[in-house]
Structure formats: C-alpha cells, structure tokens
C-alpha cells in the first residue's frame, strides 16, 4: 500500500486548515501552555511493522476527529473550516483503513499494537482533561490547536519513514 502518495497531500491540507482556524492572537495565551506528554516514541516508527504504524496513525486521526467533533469545538471554530477539516480527516481515515486491509496477511506481526493505541488514547484524554479544567476557554483551544498541529507534523514524519521503507 503506497500510503503517503494518497495521504500526505491531505495531511498538508489538514495542517493548512488548522493554521487558518485561529480566532485569537496566540500571543495572549502564552501562560496557558501545557505539557500534554506527546507520545513521541509511538511516532518514531522504529519498533513498528508497517501495519502497526498505520494503526497508530489511524488512532491519532480518529481521536483528533472526536476531539474537534464536540459541541464545545463547534462553538469555538469557524463552521466552514471545521467542515473542511472533517472532510480531510475522513479522507485520511479511509486511506489508512484501506491500507490496513491490504496489510492483512502480509506481515506475521499483529495489525495493532494495543499498548501504542492505548498510549495515544491517554494522550488525547490528557488534552480533553486540560480543556475541561480550562473550561474550554479560547486560549485553551489555541494551545490544543497548536499541540494537534505539532502532532500532525510529527505523524507526517512517520509517514515519510514508512514511504522510505517500501
């Protein structure tokens, strides 16, 4: 499955949409910075078979979709941009699912690394907890937007390594 060719353009568009989503100056939000404990090791791609790496990317995109699909999110961001954002995420999820199906039976290792999936879920739980504690304030959402943009950039690096593996 030649994932990056079908996927990386959508990833880039997702980043561009997120960059446009800002509603307030981030300079006013410096004191709201937070350590979400991004699971860097899950995106290094060294310990994964290809199918497992794809499942981690899928989980991250699914969790991002869930995070930005809440009513609190809809109340914060521009509706048109959110719709574009959902479309790109949905496209990426479809690409990854198609890839995972192609990987079935190709590798001896399991399709999913359960520990890695749980680590990604806990990361998003920390983000949701932060938003709750900050009462979904505009600055809290700005910090989360910056964090998700960073995680998407880092996941793009994993995709690039997968492409070179082929």
């Amino acid at each position: 499955c030649d994932l990056p060719q079908t996927h990386s353009l959508s990833n880039r568009r997702t980043l561009m949409i997120m960059a446009q989503m800002g509603r307030i100056s981030p300079f006013s939000c410096l004191k709201d910075r937070h350590d979400f404990g991004f699971p860097q090791e899950e995106f290094d791609g060294n310990q994964f078979q290809k199918a497992q790496a794809i499942s981690v990317l899928h989980e991250m995109i699914q969790q991002t979709f869930n995070l930005f699909s809440t009513k609190d999110s809809s109340a914060t961001w521009d509706e048109t941009l959110l719709d574009k954002f959902y479309t790109e995420l949905y496209q990426q999820l479809n690409d990854l699912e198609a890839c995972m199906m192609q990987e079935v039976g190709v590798e001896d290792t399991p399709l999913m690394n359960v520990d890695s999936i749980l680590t990604v879920r806990k990361y998003f739980q920390r983000i949701t907890l932060y938003l709750t504690e900050k009462k979904y304030s505009p600055c809290a959402w700005e910090v989360v937007r910056a964090e998700i943009m960073r995680s998407f950039s880092l996941s793009a690096n994993l995709q690039e390594r997968l492409r070179r593996k082929e």
Epitope: G22, P26, L30, K31, A146, E147
Partner: antibody, heavy 121, light 107 residues
Framework: EVQLVQSGAEVKKPGESLKISCKGS????????IGWVRQMPGKGLEWMGI????????AYSPSFQGQVTISADKSISTAYLQWSSLKASDTAMYYC??????????????WGQGTLVTVSS | DIQMTQSPSSLSASVGDRVTITCRAS??????LNWYQQKPGKAPKLLIY???SLQSGVPSRFSGSGSGTDFTLTISSLQPEDFATYYC?????????FGQGTKVEIK
C-alpha cells in the same frame, strides 16, 4: 540541521533607515515564532518583540513598540527587523531566535549569529 | 511587566567549584523560566527550559530548580568552559523579560 542566519554588520548614520534579516532553515519556518533580542555594548539581553511567520502576527515589548517594525516573508523563510530613523542609541548587537509558540518545547533553542548595527555620525 | 532579578551580578570561582545563581520574578511565573549561557562575542545558548529541563546537548553538571517566583541554576562542578555570563528569562507572559545577567569569572 536547524540554522538561523542573520545579515551582515551595518554602519549607518543617525536618521537613516535599516532592515536586517534572519533566514531560517532546517525546520518548518511557519511552525515556530521568531523573536528579536537586543544587546547594547557591554550590557544584558533585552527582548524586543516576536512574530508568528504563519500569519505575521506580532507582539512588541513596550520599550520597543513604535521604535522598530518586525515582519516576515514565509515564502523565503525570513524574518526582518527594521528602523525608519536610526538613533545613536540603536547601536547594538541584534539577535534573532526561534520560539516554539504555544507548544511545550524549549524556548529560544536556536539563535542567529547576531547582526552588529553601528549608528554614528 | 514581570521583572527578573538575578543574584549575584558577578562571582569568582575556581574549576571544580559548585556554583549557584538565583533568579527572582516580581510575580509568580509557575515554571516558565529559562537559563542561557553567553560567552563574549557569541550568541546566547539555551541551557535549561521550563525551570528544570536540560536542553539537549547540555552537560548534566547544569541543573535548574524552582517554581513560582524563586529559581536556581546550579553548576555542580565548574569547568574551564563554563566561565561566561548567565541569564534567566521568564516565558510566562509577554513582554518576555531577562534577568540582568550573572558573570562567572575565574578566581
């Protein structure tokens, strides 16, 4: 390799204008803010202001607001610091440095080599 | 603006000495404090960020501690290359502000 490369030393007369540059490479230029720091001869570090190259949003120290203008051209991964009318007191070394924005990451982890600006009649 | 006050302004020490520099903020900045080292004619170099995180590539003899208003940079065993000026900087809110610097000289 991450690098911030600044333009060369400048010698100017009072009242003249000047624009110095800071070119970023080895990283996604729009993913980090660029800050400017002044160091007058034999003195400490003073933060002047910062720019988000993704949308050119800026913030200035009150001490430098209206005295300088910070800008960026993301198409060439370059940030700028400019003066419309230099004073002798602007004589200093000027550094640019990258900042992770709202991300939990090291602040000002990479610095330019500095641009020495000398203003003298 | 948040004022940052370093002490001492300068100190003399010998190779192998334990050196401590303090930095006090005029209001609470949580853990949003960075430490930089600067040598003559060179750009500052980040040593410690978020009060206690060691920047990649910085020797482990450097450590940082503190939160709120009081912070400390410690060099556990001073080396010849450590003679320089050290600055603290708050990254809690704009305008960002630096301490006035502490010059570490050879005794």
């Amino acid at each position: 390799e991450v690098q911030l490369v600044q333009s060369g030393a400048e010698v100017k007369k009072p009242g003249e204008s000047l624009k110095i540059s800071c070119k970023g490479s080895g990283y996604s230029f729009t993913s980090y803010w660029i800050g400017w720091v002044r160091q007058m001869p034999g003195k400490g570090l003073e933060w002047m202001g910062i720019i988000d190259p993704s949308d050119s949003d800026t913030a200035y120290s009150p001490s430098f607001q209206g005295q300088v203008t910070i800008s960026a051209d993301k198409s060439i991964s370059t940030a700028y610091l400019q003066w419309s009318s230099l004073k002798a007191s602007d004589t200093a070394m000027y550094y640019c440095a990258r900042h992770p924005g709202l991300n939990w990451a090291p602040d000002f982890d990479y610095w330019g080599q500095g641009t020495l600006v000398t203003v003298s009649s | 603006d948040i004022q940052m006050t370093q002490s001492p302004s300068s100190l003399s020490a010998s190779v192998g000495d334990r050196v401590t520099i303090t930095c006090r903020a005029s209001q609470s900045i949580d853990g949003s404090l960075n430490w930089y080292q600067q040598k003559p004619g060179k750009a500052p170099k980040l040593l410690i960020y978020f009060a206690s995180s060691l920047q990649s590539g910085v020797p482990s003899r450097f450590s940082g501690s503190g939160s709120g208003t009081d912070f400390t940079l410690t060099i556990s065993s001073l080396q010849p290359e450590d003679f320089a000026t050290y600055y603290c900087q708050q990254s809690y809110d704009f305008p960002l502000t630096f301490g006035q610097g502490t010059k570490v000289e050879i005794k």
